[in-house]
Interface confidence: low
Amino acid sequence: GSTVPPMVNVTRSEASEGNITVTCRASGFYPWNITLSWRQDGVSLSHDTQQWGDVLPDGNGTYQTWVATRICQGEEQRFTCYMEHSGNHSTHPVPSGNSHHHHHHHH
């Protein structure tokens, strides 16, 4: 089938006092091979500080997955979610407040 770029959606939620969990979700992509990771100050975090979901079919012939990490509240501006799929890549910031961002990745 043809390549379908992912929709990338970054959300935040309170984890514990002074900490938040930031989650980056990619959905609606094909084929299933994807790189999704959190970066701090432009450099990927080590694997032991991130949690990944499985790459799962979403029922539409495309796939979905996620990556999350816990960060200190007030440090959000330093973190970005990096996505690479079928030779295309994009970077997505953590939203301020309780909002969330989602973007289609265009070729």
Epitope: D41, G42, E75, T80, T91
Partner: antibody, heavy 118, light 108 residues
Framework: EVQLVQSGAEVKKPGASVKVSCKAS????????IYWVRQAPGQGLEWIGY????????IYNQQFKDRVTITADTSTSTAYLELSSLRSEDTAVYYC???????????WGQGTLVTVSS | EIVLTQSPATLSLSPGERATLSCSAS???????LHWYQQKPGQAPRLLIY???NLASGIPARFSGSGSGTDFTLTISSLEPEDFAVYYC?????????FGQGTKVEIK
């Protein structure tokens, strides 16, 4: 081999502006941030700010926010630091550095001496 | 702002001796975010140790780092002539990124 090559020494009068360049080579310029740090004569190191060349995000040390502008040109893999309204206490060596794992400074430019004198 | 205080300010030792440099933080830092640099006169700093205890590329094994929380240590097991320099600790855990004021290791 990763290299950061900075522009040459500058002598400026108080109130003037200076723009220092930092040309990166040996790695993908957009894959790491560029930090700027300064060191006054005989003093320690002070972080000024950084730019993420991939998305153009810039974060400043609040102490410098009003007088500093950090930019980057991805087509030439060059980062720039501009400091305005110069004062004598801005006399320092200005360094660019590449971001490494966990916000360290893994490669450094050779430094640019900026002298502010009337 | 996290303030890093290094001690002593100056350490006078002879080649072959052991050097112990301290870095104390005003608030707790994850050990992942504490780094050490060496600077020689007229040169840019160079990364020595990252994440408290990991040697940067090309750094000899006589250098080691340890610590947690607010107290961190850089140890040079046996000083070589080229080790006489200024050493800085740096934290990357919160903004602004900050450095200690430095410890000068000089020849006695």
């Amino acid at each position: 081999e990763v290299q950061l090559v900075q522009s040459g020494a500058e002598v400026k009068k108080p109130g003037a502006s200076v723009k220092v360049s930092c040309k990166a080579s040996g790695y993908a310029f957009t894959s790491n941030n560029i930090y700027w740090v300064r060191q006054a004569p005989g003093q320690g190191l002070e972080w000024i700010g950084y730019i993420d060349p991939y998305i153009g995000r810039i974060i400043y040390n609040q102490q410098f926010k009003d007088r500093v502008t950090i930019t980057a040109d991805t087509s030439t893999s060059t980062a720039y630091l501009e400091l305005s309204s110069l004062r004598s206490e801005d006399t320092a060596v200005y360094y660019c550095s590449r971001s490494g794992e966990r916000s360290n400074f893994d490669y450094w430019g050779q430094g640019t001496l900026v002298t502010v004198s009337s | 702002e996290i303030v890093l205080t290094q001690s002593p300010a100056t350490l006078s030792l002879s080649p072959g001796e052991r050097a112990t440099l301290s870095c104390s933080a005003s608030s707790s830092i994850s050990s992942n975010y504490l780094h050490w640099y060496q600077q020689k006169p007229g040169q840019a700093p160079r990364l020595l140790i990252y994440r408290t205890s990991n040697l940067a590329s090309g750094i000899p094994a006589r250098f080691s780092g340890s610590g947690s929380g607010t107290d961190f240590t850089l140890t040079i097991s046996s000083l070589e002539p080229e080790d006489f320099a200024v050493y800085y600790c740096q934290q990357g855990g919160s903004l602004p990124l900050t450095f200690g004021q430095g410890t000068k290791v000089e020849i006695k």
